[in-house]
């Protein structure tokens, strides 16, 4: 059966409205299709940064071979949305689709790709292109994970104790310290799916004068350092 593998190609470009745009389409590596009518479904997990534009692609099948192209969109807490194009009548139809930022890239008879303009947290979900041919269906599915960059702050709150916070990230950031101290980490979950991570560390050893908080996140990593003073130091703030 048609079984493309899951190696990926990620393209990034700048659109003229200055939003970063990423397109996740199949890498051109795939196991040859035999003549079975059971055409395998391929699913990809795809992390995409919030506020960028995203383009999702269908399998590489020429329009002349198609009967119907359907995008099925399943977002949390919403009814399934479908966008369909029927070649014979050259008509498009939408069912339960309310988000105007999710559209065909252009006319579906010219380009079957789906685009999400200015990705938001609410776009977390499952997107599937279904290409109906006379001999069976080809599928390409995406589990879209929207990434939110946390705001990172580092401050000293009392003698030889520092607090590093990664606020409202998605998914949760990971905080580590150099050098290691006596640390406690808490996570606070918000209703929009973001997480604030707070790590509080204390250093008894007096020869430790500078400490570094390292925040690891899928959107990028950030390091901040602070000098341990007998009095609280100035607050530092940064975006990843």
């Amino acid at each position: 059966a048609a079984q493309p593998n899951n190696s990926l190609m990620l393209q990034t470009s700048k659109e003229n409205h200055a939003l970063a745009s990423s397109s996740l389409c199949m890498d051109e590596k795939q196991i040859t299709q035999n003549y079975s009518k059971v055409l395998a479904e391929v699913n990809t997990s795809w992390p995409v940064k919030m506020a960028t534009n995203a383009v999702l692609c269908c399998p590489p099948i020429a329009l002349r071979n198609l009967i119907i192209i359907t995008w099925e969109i399943i977002l949390r807490g919403q009814p399934s949305c479908t966008k369909a194009y029927k070649k014979e009548t050259n008509e498009t139809k939408e069912t339960n689709c309310t988000d105007e930022r999710i559209t065909w890239v252009s006319r579906p008879d010219q380009n079957s790709d789906l685009q999400i303009r200015t990705v938001a947290i609410t776009h977390d979900g499952y997107y599937r292109c279904i290409m109906v041919t006379p001999d069976g269906n080809f599928h390409r599915g995406y589990h879209l994970q929207v990434l939110v960059t946390p705001e990172v702050t580092l401050f000293q709150n009392r003698n030889r104790t520092a607090v590093c916070k990664a606020v409202a990230g998605k998914p949760a950031a990971h905080i580590s310290w150099i050098p290691e101290g006596d640390c406690a980490t808490k996570q606070e979950y918000w209703s929009n799916g973001t997480v604030t991570v707070k790590s509080t560390c204390h250093w008894e050893v007096h020869n430790v004068s500078t400490v570094t908080c390292h925040v690891s996140h899928l959107t990028g990593n950030k390091s901040l350092y602070i000098e341990l003073l007998p009095v609280p130091g100035a607050k530092k703030s940064a975006k990843l």
């Epitope: 048609a2 190609m9 002349r64 006379p134």
Partner: antibody, heavy 119, light 110 residues
Framework: QVQLVQSGAEVKKPGASVKVSCKAS????????MHWVRQAPGQGLEWMGY????????NYNEKFKGRVTMTRDTSTSTVYMELSSLRSEDTAVYYC????????????WGQGTLVTVSS | DIVLTQSPASLAVSPGQRATITCRAS??????????MHWYQQKPGQPPKLLIY???NLESGVPARFSGSGSGTDFTLTINPVEANDTANYYC????????FGQGTKVEIK
């Protein structure tokens, strides 16, 4: 297995027409687009057009429009390519080829039919 | 229409060596992350045989000595190492809506 068998060689006079057949077996005939390609002696491959047996759609190379007609007979799983107003430069081997869905690649070809145009 | 230009027109290679054929398209044949470029081998008296599809995918049953690469407008077919029975004509092809072939490259084994 998937197989395309073409009709035998033809000799035609200039101005005549020729109709080459391509019989398909081993798959659902109406499900796959069929292309026609020709190759003059010692020359390269030249795409002529295609027919989609599912809906009878055709698309021809501009060079052959008005002279070529592609048809299909679903009862015999056969596609036909008819070329009219033949001239000596139409002397060539004519191939049918089936297009596979994934990537629009042509994985199966007929054995070829030699058409000779000579007075 | 997209025009495909192959080079070189002919190529003589010793067994065990590498043969490289290039194909340049007059405009991009890549869309939605896929390059609709295929490579065929044709031996005298035979129909063409598919070697590579979508620029870099090896067709089932084709030896791994054959490989394809490229995207956009520039594509390459590589045979490494070349064997005696690789003597043939090789064609690049763009196949998506309107279909075109390169003019062919004749590969001879010394």
């Amino acid at each position: 297995q998937v197989q395309l068998v073409q009709s035998g060689a033809e000799v035609k006079k200039p101005g005549a027409s020729v109709k080459v057949s391509c019989k398909a077996s081993g798959y659902t005939f109406t499900s796959y687009v069929m292309h026609w390609v020709r190759q003059a002696p010692g020359q390269g491959l030249e795409w002529m057009g295609y027919i989609n047996p599912y809906n009878d759609d055709t698309n021809y190379n501009e060079k052959f429009k008005g002279r070529v007609t592609m048809t299909r007979d679903t009862s015999t799983s056969t596609v036909y390519m008819e070329l009219s107003s033949l001239r000596s430069e139409d002397t060539a081997v004519y191939y049918c080829a089936r297009e596979d869905y994934y990537g629009s690649r042509w994985g199966t070809w007929g054995q070829g039919t030699l058409v000779t145009v000579s007075s | 229409d997209i025009v495909l230009t192959q080079s070189p027109a002919s190529l003589a290679v010793s067994p065990g060596q590498r043969a490289t054929i290039t194909c340049r398209a007059s405009k991009s044949v890549s869309t939605s992350g896929y390059s609709y470029m295929h490579w065929y081998q044709q031996k005298p008296g035979q129909p063409p045989k598919l070697l590579i599809y979508l620029a870099s995918n090896l067709e089932s049953g084709v030896p791994a000595r054959f490989s394809g690469s490229g995207s956009g407008t520039d594509f390459t077919l590589t045979i490494n190492p070349v064997e005696a029975n690789d003597t043939a004509n090789y064609y690049c092809q763009h196949s998506h809506e309107l279909d075109t072939f390169g003019q062919g490259t004749k590969v001879e084994i010394k």
